[in-house]
């Protein structure tokens, strides 16, 4: 059986300030069981953008219904984009663990750039 892959099809996305940005991510398998998270940045200081399991992310919506039984689409949309949102976003799969989930695989990242709001 092939190991799960995390696919972020776009290397980069450009969005005008004030618009929403869609960041696409898909899994190739339902296994292993565990949540996905979106981060900005790849280092120790990476910022949590969305956690499937818990948390409050008022500007983030999921593109598809993540609780659907066979869902493999973990794309998100971030509303009201500002220049401060620029950066590289990573979709990361975690394997369910006890007590803590363990990072399993990361997508290659999507760089979000923000254009000036059209006048």
């Amino acid at each position: 059986e092939d190991e799960l892959q995390v696919i972020q099809p776009e290397k980069s996305v450009s969005v005008a300030a004030g618009e929403s940005a869609t960041l696409r991510c898909a899994m190739t398998s339902l296994i292993p069981v565990g949540p996905i998270m979106w981060f900005r940045g790849a280092g120790a200081g990476r910022e949590l953008i969305y956690n499937q399991k818990e948390g409050h992310f008022p500007r983030v919506t999921t593109v598809s219904e993540l609780t659907k039984r066979n869902n493999l689409d973990f794309s998100i949309s971030i509303s009201n984009i500002t220049p401060a949102d620029a950066g590289t976003y990573y979709c990361v799969k975690f394997r369910k663990g006890s007590p803590d989930d363990v990072e399993f695989k990361s997508g290659a990242g999507t760089e979000l750039s923000v254009r000036a709001k059209p006048s």
Epitope: M37, F39, R40, G41, A42, G43, A44, G45, R46, E47, L48, I49, G55, H56, G87, D100, D101, E103
Partner: antibody, heavy 117, light 108 residues
């Protein structure tokens, strides 16, 4: 406004323990890594420890095995448990918020730890 | 561990003059270098990251540049509030996050 307030510093003897706290407000604590940086009297800055958003911990070699960083997301509070304290641990301890660029954009005012017999 | 060496240790400058000081990394850090300002009795304040990007609210008189592993912070026209100690920090993806020893900018 982002605020970080450290507490728990004080005077202890070598070998003793102390637990520092850092209460955070003004940002979504769960979404950011947080860190401790210290400054010995009249000296420069020294990075001590960092805890990521997923709870992964990192330490400077000088404190590894003696200090433990932790976070309580429900209380928006960062901790530093310091055991086996030495005279060279005497410093002002600052907590700071970490950006995704791995820089420290907001700092507390610090709490002084003095280790002396 | 990456060692950052700042020079000079102390810089004496008159208000209104230009101040330039440097930070050299012992190995490559790309552009992952930040600058902080610290005044007596205060916490450090982030000025510059990624070698030349000003942090939010930092005046345009502060600028950073890079040439290989040598980084420079320039204050184009020193104001009274700029007299302080300046530290560089490498901010590559993974710890340890080392700081330089600092440069004290004092009034001439």
């Amino acid at each position: 406004d982002v605020q970080l307030v450290e507490s728990g510093g004080g005077l202890v003897r070598p070998g003793e323990s102390l637990r520092l706290s850092c209460a955070a407000s003004g940002f979504t604590f769960t979404n950011y890594a947080v860190t401790w940086v210290r400054q010995a009297p009249g000296e420069g800055l020294e990075w001590v420890s960092l805890i990521s958003v997923t709870g992964t911990t990192y330490y400077a070699d000088s404190v590894k095995g003696r200090f433990t960083i932790s976070r309580d997301n429900s209380k928006s509070t960062l901790y530093l448990q310091m055991n086996g304290l030495r005279a060279e641990d005497t410093a002002v301890y600052y907590c700071a918020k970490v950006t995704w660029k791995n820089v420290f954009d907001y700092w507390g005012l610090g709490t002084l730890v003095t280790v002396s017999s | 561990e990456i060692v950052l060496t700042q020079s000079p240790g102390t810089l004496s400058v008159s208000p209104g003059e230009r101040a330039t000081f440097s930070c050299r990394a012992s190995q490559t850090v790309g552009s992952k270098l930040a600058w902080y300002q610290q005044k007596p009795g205060q916490a450090p304040r982030l000025l510059i990251y990624d070698a030349n990007t000003r942090a939010t609210g930092i005046p345009a008189r502060f600028s950073g540049s890079r040439s290989g592993t040598e980084f420079t912070l320039t204050i184009s026209s020193l104001q009274s509030e700029d007299f302080a100690v300046y530290y560089c920090q490498q901010h590559t993806d993974w710890p340890p996050y080392t700081f330089g020893g600092g440069t004290k900018v004092e009034i001439k």
